[in-house]
Interface confidence: low
């Protein structure tokens, strides 16, 4: 019988969507191009539920972790990489302090219990996030899972 | 168990100011996440976003109303104010005070305070 | 400022019908738009939030699909207390309300 795998080798499914956290580290800019080369998003959080998730994962594994949200185009408003805004809501998000801007950070990181704003040129880990597959009869997700990576060498 | 309950004069006169009071229960408008808002409805209208204030007293104004109006709380009476200035007859509507909830990322509108009617006239 | 207006501005119906009403943005809004649901001489009550969760309390006969700039709510089957007006509400952007929606008994 075949099994329906809703996200790629090595993905992780959350309430409808699939997560892959990298294993190595790139900037701010070559991380967005690593999840589009494997059909993802750096990660935008939309939910109470996702951000409690990806909060967990990224301080178990005690790494900092780039998410796609940045102030590049205008300082101090901060812009999801899908164009949306950051919500007035999710400023209970960001560790004690934070933003700061110290020293031109611009980009989003998960560190430790909350967000922190570093500067894009650090290599960091990062989270991508796609749709996950329906799984319908109809379609090619019922296959084995093939691995699917968005680790290339740093370049 | 939650409740907000608007306060204010019931007439007020064009070019006078007006002073709500939203009063407040069963939540702190210093968690953080919560927000408390001010909306109001026209007779036979639709519903009109005013003004808000956040927890930590970021405050957000409609565009078009914003040299107008301005809110405040007072986080140990659990009231949020709103002033309006130079008040027209157009501006007679039923007044609303609502609460976005803690927690959430988006910033909807959860409990309703039950409104109360101003009206604009000489 | 994003403007949210909704179709029909006035629907007649029946108990027991399958309701449609549509909330369009004049840009993207993702998921972050709300229904609620007000009777004569009462506040609004909230129904829906993030475009398809349904409040704690509501019937399940209510619910909410879309992102984007294109989104509906649905009650699956009329009942005599649902006839009302439903408002849409965006808040990607600040906010804005739709202009209303009235269901009235057939």
């Known amino acids: 019988e075949r099994l329906c795998h809703p996200c790629p080798w090595e993905w992780t499914f959350f309430q409808g969507n699939c997560y892959f956290m990298s294993n190595s580290q790139r900037n701010w800019h070559d991380s967005i191009t690593a999840c589009k080369e494997v059909g993802a998003q750096l990660v935008v959080i939309k939910s109470a539920e996702e951000q409690n998730f990806l909060q967990l994962q990224s301080s178990r594994s005690n790494r900092f972790t780039w998410m796609g949200l940045s102030d590049l185009n205008q300082e101090g408003t901060w812009q999801w990489v899908d164009g949306s805004p950051l919500l007035p809501s999710f400023k209970q998000y960001w560790n004690r302090g934070e933003p700061n801007n110290v020293g031109e950070e611009d980009c989003a990181e998960f560190s430790g219990n909350g967000w922190n704003d570093d500067k894009c040129n650090l290599a960091k880990f990062w989270i991508c996030k796609k749709s996950a597959a329906s799984c319908s009869r109809d379609e090619e997700q019922f296959l084995s899972p093939a691995p699917a990576t968005p680790n290339p060498p740093p370049a | 168990q939650v409740t907000l309950r608007e306060s204010g004069p019931a007439l007020v006169k064009p070019t006078q100011t007006l002073t709500l009071t939203c009063t407040f229960s069963g939540f702190s408008l210093s968690t953080s996440g919560v927000s408390v808002t001010w909306i109001r409805q026209p007779p036979g209208k639709a519903l009109e976003w005013l003004a808000l204030i956040d927890w930590d007293d970021d405050k957000y104004y409609s565009t078009s109303l914003k040299t107008r109006l301005a809110i405040s709380k007072d986080t140990s009476k659990n009231q949020v104010v709103l002033t309006m200035t130079n008040m027209d007859p157009v501006d007679t509507a039923t007044y609303y005070c609502?609460?976005?909830?803690?927690?959430?990322?988006?910033?909807?509108?959860?409990?309703w305070g039950r409104g109360t009617l101003v009206t604009v006239s000489s | 400022d994003i403007q949210m207006t909704q179709s029909p501005s006035t629907l007649s119906a029946s108990v027991g019908d399958r309701v449609t009403i549509t909330c369009r943005a004049s840009q993207s809004i993702s998921t972050w738009l709300a229904w609620y649901q007000q009777k004569p001489g009462k506040a609004p009550k909230l129904l829906i939030y993030?475009?398809?969760s349904l409040e704690s309390g509501v019937p399940s006969r209510f619910s909410g699909s879309g992102s984007g700039t294109e989104f509906t709510l649905t009650i699956s089957s009329l009942q005599p207390d649902d006839f009302a007006t439903y408002y849409c509400?965006?808040?990607?952007?600040?906010?804005?309300f739709g202009q209303g929606t009235k269901v009235e008994i057939k």
């Open positions: 609502a609460r976005t909830p803690s927690g959430s990322y988006g910033r909807y509108f959860d409990l």
């Open positions: 509400q965006q808040y990607n952007s600040y906010w804005t």
């Open positions: 993030e475009a398809s």
